[in-house]
């Protein structure tokens, strides 16, 4: 028995080939016997019922001459999985046709985080296995619905997944799109009195959905709201702001949001929710402050806000070697020279930040 | 542990409409293909419908096309038999049944491993 | 649809005894065969499968063998919970059918 794998929706060909290479006399049937299609001498195909029950059936009449006469079933349905028998030269063979179809769980739009199941819709009698293929190469293998947790952006795009069966295969390409925020974490490094402004883009834009961006800065002990804001057709609206910050939304796409002048005591991290239909996505915000000062005869450079255990404050005179370089959030120069000093917030060879202040002579308080 | 329940039998008569379901417990049930069972009473057994773990793909036997519809609620861990213009010849334990898988050498191998205790259908004047 | 005819209909064998029990298939079914056990007021229960394997749990003394369209399940050495009724079942293709059964009885 031949066997012929299709796809759902799609066209197969059922082979059958007579030895003489030349056009004779041949009949499609069901297996129960029912007659599908065939060519009584005439080179004229004859239907076995009528059109609208067979008009997805055809054969090639082109293939005739070369005692090729196969069936071909358009828009393939899962019920068309059945043995079919294609009669001539008095001999009988059978083409089992098994077709498969591979689905997304409930939908093909997911968010970041959340699990993917990709079941395979098969014929009763089939033993397949699959295999699929991520957009970032990862493969995974099973029966007949296989899952993957936690999905990352990366998981954007084209999965293939492969269907096997009696060594025969069969391909499927499914796009699945992961929604979430482009990067997991931003970081703003900012002198006191700068402005701070944070994108949050996305990688999709027809969702409508709210959100919130929930602070809590170093010397706090608890996640206060700072903003509150609605998105409805790719415009950006607030719904709740804290006074004192501010703040301000950008009324477009993607989120923006700016603090027009920082200070020490804003220094510390966030979390923005975008609730969805689908659920909730998550960003991380950070925000390090640096303020240099000069406080009678002395010049302090600090930093307040998530920084690594291995980032170093540096306080030096410009073109001069760093007078104090420690991996501590508060650094002091009692006695500064008159002149421009820099300070530096570094991690390893990168600065990740710097602030400078003209001390013009010692004992005069500045900021 | 893994268990599947069937409910929803009993006495109607010809012509009459009847809704079974199987409740499942002990394991992801929308991982898995299901399947109705029946047998007649004193008799052998007869596959009845089979439906895909998404319920996109349905099978029914010869002698129940059009009148029974199997379907199934992933969300409840449920599937279901609804049974309309039922005949005497429909009189039987109904069966409802996982379809399992075993892998070997990355080879699939399919087969009924969980069944239910099943519900009794009489269908009588 | 395919046809499983099961043999003997009925067969009595004393405890401890070797059991054989046939089905054929009227046309092949490849290895996409089962066999079941059912008591009286009891859902079948998965023996076989894939003609030789056994299910979980399952004795080593029930075996299955064959393919194509002739299959036997032996019981090497009967134990009295082994008597009741056996059905083969083919799932090679749509419709899926079992044999009318084999009653195993105690002699």
């Known amino acids: 028995k031949t066997l012929v794998l299709g796809k759902e929706g799609e066209s197969a060909e059922l082979p059958c080939e007579s030895s003489q290479k030349k056009i004779t006399v041949f009949t499609w049937k069901f297996s129960d016997q029912r007659k599908i299609l065939g060519q009584h001498g005439k080179g004229v195909l004859i239907r076995g019922g009528s059109p609208s029950q067979f008009d997805r059936f055809d054969s090639k009449k082109g293939a005739w001459e070369k005692g090729s006469f196969p069936l071909i079933i358009n828009k393939l349905k899962m019920e068309d999985s059945q043995t079919y028998i294609c009669e001539l030269e008095n001999r009988k063979e059978e083409v089992e046709l098994w077709v498969f179809k591979v689905t997304a769980n409930s939908d093909t739009h997911l968010l970041q985080g959340q699990s993917l199941t990709l079941t395979l819709e098969s014929p009763p009698g089939s033993s397949p296995s699959v295999q699929c293929r991520s957009p970032r190469g990862k493969n995974i293998q099973g029966g007949k619905t296989l899952s993957v947790s936690q999905l990352e952006l990366q998981d954007s795009g084209t999965w293939t997944c492969t269907v096997l069966q009696n060594q025969k295969k069969v391909e499927f390409k499914i796009d699945i799109v992961v929604l979430a925020f482009q990067s997991t974490a931003i970081t703003a490094y900012k002198s006191e009195g700068e402005s701070a402004e944070f994108s949050f883009p996305l990688n999709f834009a027809e969702e409508n959905g709210w959100g919130e961006l929930m602070w809590k800065a170093e010397k706090d002990s608890f996640f206060q709201p700072w903003i509150s804001f609605s998105i409805k057709n790719k415009e950006v609206s607030v719904q709740k702001s804290t006074k004192d910050l501010k703040l301000q939304l950008k009324e477009t796409l993607p989120l923006t949001l700016k603090i027009p002048q920082v200070s020490l005591q804003f220094a510390g991290s966030g979390n923005l929710t975008l609730t969805l239909d689908k659920g909730t996505l998550h960003q991380e915000v950070n925000l390090v402050v640096m303020k240099v000062a000069q406080l009678n005869n002395t010049l302090t450079c600090e930093v307040m806000g998530p920084t690594s255990p291995k980032m170093r404050l540096t306080l030096k005179q410009e073109n001069q070697e760093a007078r104090v370089s420690e991996e501590q959030k508060v650094v002091q120069v009692v006695a500064p020279e008159t002149g421009l000093w820099q300070c530096l917030l570094s991690e390893g060879d990168k600065v990740k930040m710097d602030s400078r202040i003209q001390v013009l002579s010692r004992g005069v308080n500045q900021t | 542990q893994v268990q599947l329940v069937e409910s929803g039998g009993g006495l109607v008569k010809p012509g009459g409409s009847l809704r079974l379901s199987c409740s499942a417990s002990?394991?992801?049930?929308?991982?898995?293909?299901m399947n109705w069972i029946r047998q007649a009473p004193g008799k052998g057994l007869e596959w009845v419908s089979y439906i895909s773990s998404s319920g996109i793909t349905i099978f029914y036997t010869d002698s129940v096309k059009g009148r029974f519809t199997i379907s199934r609620d992933n969300a409840k861990n449920s599937l279901y038999l609804q049974m309309n213009s039922l005949r005497a010849e429909d009189t039987a334990v109904y069966y409802c049944?996982?379809?399992?898988?075993?892998?070997?050498?990355?080879?699939?191998?399919?087969?009924?491993?969980?069944w239910g205790k099943g519900t009794t259908v009489t269908v009588s004047s | 649809e395919i046809v499983m005819t099961q043999s003997p209909a009925a067969l009595s064998v004393s405890p401890g005894e070797r059991a054989t029990l046939s089905c054929r298939a009227s046309q092949s079914v490849s290895n996409k065969f089962a066999w079941y056990q059912q008591k009286p007021g009891q859902a079948p229960r998965l023996l076989i499968y894939?003609?030789?394997t056994r299910a979980t749990s399952i004795p080593a003394r029930f075996s299955g063998s064959g393919s194509g369209t002739e299959f036997t399940l032996t019981i090497s050495s009967l134990q009295s919970e082994d008597f009741a009724v056996y059905y083969c079942?083919?799932?090679?293709?749509?419709?899926?059918?079992f044999g009318q059964g084999t009653k195993l009885e105690i002699k």
């Open positions: 894939n003609a030789s």
């Open positions: 002990g394991f992801t049930f929308s991982d898995y293909y």
């Open positions: 079942q083919h799932y090679n293709n749509w419709p899926y059918t």
């Open positions: 049944a996982r379809e399992d898988y075993s892998n070997y050498e990355d080879h699939y191998y399919y087969y009924t491993g969980v």
